[in-house]
Interface confidence: low
């Protein structure tokens, strides 16, 4: 119907506009309606001034699109012609009365089709549905991916390219680990990965200054030590260095009135010449306090060598060895008397024997045919020595003898001449004056070592060595080494050593292979007034130890490795040092620090005496430990 | 062959101590590989240990928290025995008490006293 | 402390049936620190294993025990008549010396 409504119009117009003129009003009756024919008539004039015989010839060849004046005006009133719409946008023109209607592409929107619907930011389908990138082009939009991912089949989403199986040696030695659009080259912790030779490159991180004292740098890591002898730890930043704390105070007074008997490990601590008229006897007194079973207490001499007197202990009581030209004699007796308290001693020569008496009691009188020492020149001339004897008299003696003896004598007189001279000596130096108050045990003080030559095989044990050791400690710092075995190669092939735990106020016990802990004791509370006690026991296959609150098999993966080098190193030459190490690197274990406080050690079923060592430092205390530091009103 | 034959009351008033005694065959109490402990045992609470002591070159001791503070274990090494003393008990501390040998080093009980049942009670 | 939960609380079963009982420590207990006793109505444990997994002396080779760390397992290969009793677990790795609850092994 409507394109006969058309047709009709067409005709009419034909009829009434292009064969003959129309005016405004006959135009109104072609189209019956205001709006087409207000649109209709300027347009129709236009047509007319254009296509008037002769005019404007010029202009109608290039600019009017129509050849005659009938195409002119026909085309009036299709509103698309010429196209309104958007040529890229459009679909179809649709002409309406005075108007037209534009139906768009997909992907085009607006009056005429002219805008571009932006896809990627429709919210009804975000990012255009592509799972990464979404450009938009005029009209449409397509998604795209990111640098190292691939499309897929459905043209939205995105696939990650693995990298590392493309190319598998896109790393060099590195590990390559895919990502998300790429990969990295990644190194074992410490080191660094070199893009050039691509290949992993240690970090060497002492060069950064990591360490406050000593960087060792190693494949892969680094390592912090602190001088342990010199009384520095480790701190918990594993960098920096801190003092090794004292966490039970010792009482440590001295008296100048006392003297120290076991100053030097190995020598005299007192050498007195007395030049007297050659009436005078040999006499002696002195209070006597030890907790030592065997030592000298003095020993006198002639001038010339020719007699001699030692006063000594073994087994705790009193021992007299004499010789001169008449007799040669050894006598032992009284009671014991190494029981950590003050016993008056007194040795007296009298006309026919030699009078010992405690506590003015006679527990001995020795026989002699003639005066001890003879005098010459109408003098008696005697040498005497406290705490040990020349070299050369060891040889001599009835009795062989351990000369050094942790003990203390206080209010001596020597040949009834007091004490005078004396006390000003020993007032000088520190280092000869005694504790005033003392308790059983081995004392370290955080200075030196001892050293033992301990043969730990046992033919008859399938195993070949075997060490058991059981540790009585009372310590005074929290950081040091108690016990180490020590190699020819300067190397610690197992060390037992206190550390201050993380944990408030509480240590750890740490067991070390060479520099490696191979097991941890954790959170002990050791600094009190109460001896703690451990013990453990290693042979190449097993390491158990036993403490109050735990005991344990150690068993871990590496435990087979490294007691396979504590195997080595015990079918070679170990030596034994308790209370530190000697010199050896700082890196040869995990503390370094020497032990600092009370400590009593039995191997293999035997009590280590300090006065047996090979040597020991001189102010270990083989015999005797100071009390622990009682807090008084006043202080 | 260890035996452990257990002694002492039955029943105990509350706030007063509780004692009991375990006496060693066949091992020393003064042994240095083993270890000599009380445990007990209540339908409240089950089986508990309490602590014991053991000699080392010397003598230690070792208690559960829980009963740290009123608990004393003795050896008494001339009659090869050891004891029980728990103070200020409460009807909270009626149970079966056992003695037991800790094995070696360890804290397993391979050898258990008779056990002896104590009542808490006015 | 370290906890020792027993399971099941009971286990129902025939004579000549395999029996599993499990224990289960809040934190590990070392080197395999764990013992298994069994107890009769009126007597004291008696030790069955020692060490997660090694027979004490004179005990059956029906009872094995096996596990380390925190999960531990007594196995009874074929249940006899004298074997429903009360299962105790106890670790001895550190003090305070703890046990499990128990689980008890009943006839069907």
């Known amino acids: 119907a409507n394109s006969l409504l058309e047709e009709t119009k067409q005709g009419n117009l034909e009829r009434e506009c292009i064969e003959e003129l129309c005016n405004k009003e006959e135009a109104r009756e072609v189209f019956e309606n205001d709006p087409e024919t207000d649109y209709f008539y300027p347009k129709y004039l236009v047509c007319l001034r254009s296509f008037q015989t002769g005019l404007f010839t010029a202009a109608r060849q290039s600019t009017n699109a129509y050849p005659d004046l009938r195409s002119c005006v026909n085309a009036i009133p299709d509103q698309c012609s010429p196209l309104p719409c958007n040529e890229d946008g459009y679909m179809s023109c649709k002409d309406g009365k005075a108007s037209f209607t534009c139906t768009c592409k997909p992907g085009w929107q607006g009056e005429k089709c002219e805008f571009d619907i932006n896809e990627c930011k429709d919210p009804s389908n975000i990012n255009g549905g592509c799972s990464q990138i979404c450009d938009n082009t005029p009209g449409s939009y397509h998604c795209s991916c990111k640098n190292g991912f691939v499309m897929l089949s459905n043209k939205k989403d995105c696939k990650d390219v693995d990298e590392c199986s493309l190319k598998p040696s896109i790393c060099g030695t590195a590990v390559c680990k895919n990502i998300p659009g790429d990969f990295e080259c990644e190194c074992p912790e410490g080191y660094r990965y070199n893009l050039k030779s691509k290949s992993c490159e240690d970090i060497d991180e002492c060069s950064e200054n990591m360490c406050a004292q000593l960087c060792v740098n190693y494949p892969g890591g680094y390592t912090c030590y602190c001088d342990g002898k010199k009384g520095f730890k480790l701190a918990q930043d594993q960098k920096s260095c801190e003092v090794v704390s004292v966490c039970l105070p010792l009482n440590l007074d001295t008296k100048y009135e006392l003297l120290y008997l076991a100053e030097q490990f190995a020598g005299v601590v007192l050498y007195l010449k007395f030049r007297l008229p050659e009436i005078s006897r040999f006499s002696a007194e002195f209070d006597f306090r030890t907790y030592d079973s065997e030592g000298v207490i003095l020993y006198a001499e002639s001038i010339d060598h020719s007699a001699w007197l030692l006063i000594a202990l073994r087994g705790g009581k009193i021992e007299v060895q004499l010789k001169n030209e008449h007799t040669s004699k050894i006598t032992t007796g009284g009671d014991v008397i190494n029981n950590g308290l003050w016993n008056m001693v007194s040795v007296e020569e009298l006309e026919h024997s030699i009078s010992i008496k405690i506590a003015k009691e006679a527990v001995m009188d020795i026989n002699k045919p003639g005066p001890l020492f003879k005098p010459e020149n109408g003098l008696l001339e005697t040498k005497v020595y406290f705490a040990g004897f020349p070299r050369k008299v060891e040889s001599e003696l009835i009795k062989p003898i351990n000369p050094r003896l942790d003990g203390c004598i206080r209010s001596w007189n020597l040949m009834k001449q007091g004490a005078s001279g004396i006390k000003e000596i020993i007032q000088e130096k520190q280092n000869k004056h005694c504790l005033v108050t003392v308790e059983k045990g081995s004392y370290y003080p955080g200075s030196g070592i001892a050293q033992f030559h301990i043969d730990y095989n046992n033919v008859s044990s399938a195993e070949g060595w075997h060490v058991n050791v059981t540790l009585n400690i009372r310590p005074s710092t929290g950081t040091g080494v108690m016990l180490a075995l020590v190699s020819g190669n300067n190397t610690v092939p197992f060390a037992v050593s206190l550390v201050d735990s993380t944990s408030e106020k509480s240590q750890d016990i740490l067991l070390s292979v060479e520099n490696t802990v191979i097991y941890r004791i954790q959170a002990l509370s050791l600094c009190s007034d109460q001896q703690s006690h451990l013990e453990f026991r290693v042979n190449r296959n097993n390491l158990e130890l036993s403490t109050p609150l735990k005991i344990e098999t150690i068993s871990h993966e590496d435990l087979q490795r490294q007691l396979a080098v504590l195997d080595k190193a015990m079918k070679a030459k170990v030596a034994t040092y308790l209370g530190g190490l000697p010199d050896v690197p700082f890196s040869a274990t995990p503390v370094n620090a020497f032990y600092n406080g009370c400590m009593e050690v039995n191997i293999n079923g035997v009590q280590l005496d300090l006065d047996e060592a090979i040597s020991k430092h001189n102010d270990i205390r083989a015999h005797s430990c100071p009390s622990v530091w009682k807090k008084t009103k006043n202080s | 062959q260890v035996q452990l034959q257990q002694s002492g009351p039955g029943l105990v008033k509350p706030s007063q101590t509780l004692s009991l005694t375990c006496a060693i065959s066949g091992d020393s109490v003064s042994n240095n590989n083993a270890a000599w402990n009380w445990i007990r045992q209540s339908p409240s609470r089950g089986l508990e240990w309490l602590g014991g002591?053991?000699?080392?070159?010397?003598?230690?001791?070792d208690y559960a928290v829980s009963v740290k503070s009123r608990i004393i274990i003795n050896p008494v090494t001339s009659k090869n025995q050891f004891s029980l003393q728990l103070n200020s008990v409460t009807p909270e501390d009626t149970a079966v008490y056992y003695c037991a040998r800790g094995s070696s080093w360890y804290r397993f009980f391979d050898y258990w006293g008779q056990g002896t049942l104590v009542t808490v009670s006015s | 402390e370290i906890v020792l939960t027993q399971s099941p609380g009971t286990l129902s079963l025939s004579p000549g049936e395999r029996a599993t009982l499990s224990c289960r420590a809040s934190?590990?207990?070392?080197?395999?620190?764990l013992a298994w006793y069994q107890q009769k109505p009126g007597q004291a444990p008696r030790l069955l294993i020692s060490g997660a997994s090694g027979r004490a002396t004179g005990i059956p080779d029906r009872f094995s025990g096996s596990g380390s760390g925190t999960d531990f397992t007594l196995t009874i290969s074929r249940l006899e008549p004298e074997d429903f009793t009360v299962y105790y677990c106890?670790?001895?790795?550190?003090?305070?010396?703890?046990f499990g609850q128990g689980t008890k092994l009943e006839i069907k």
């Open positions: 934190q590990s207990v070392g080197s395999s620190y």
């Open positions: 106890q670790q001895y790795g550190s003090s305070p010396y703890t």
């Open positions: 002591t053991y000699y080392r070159s010397k003598w230690y001791n």
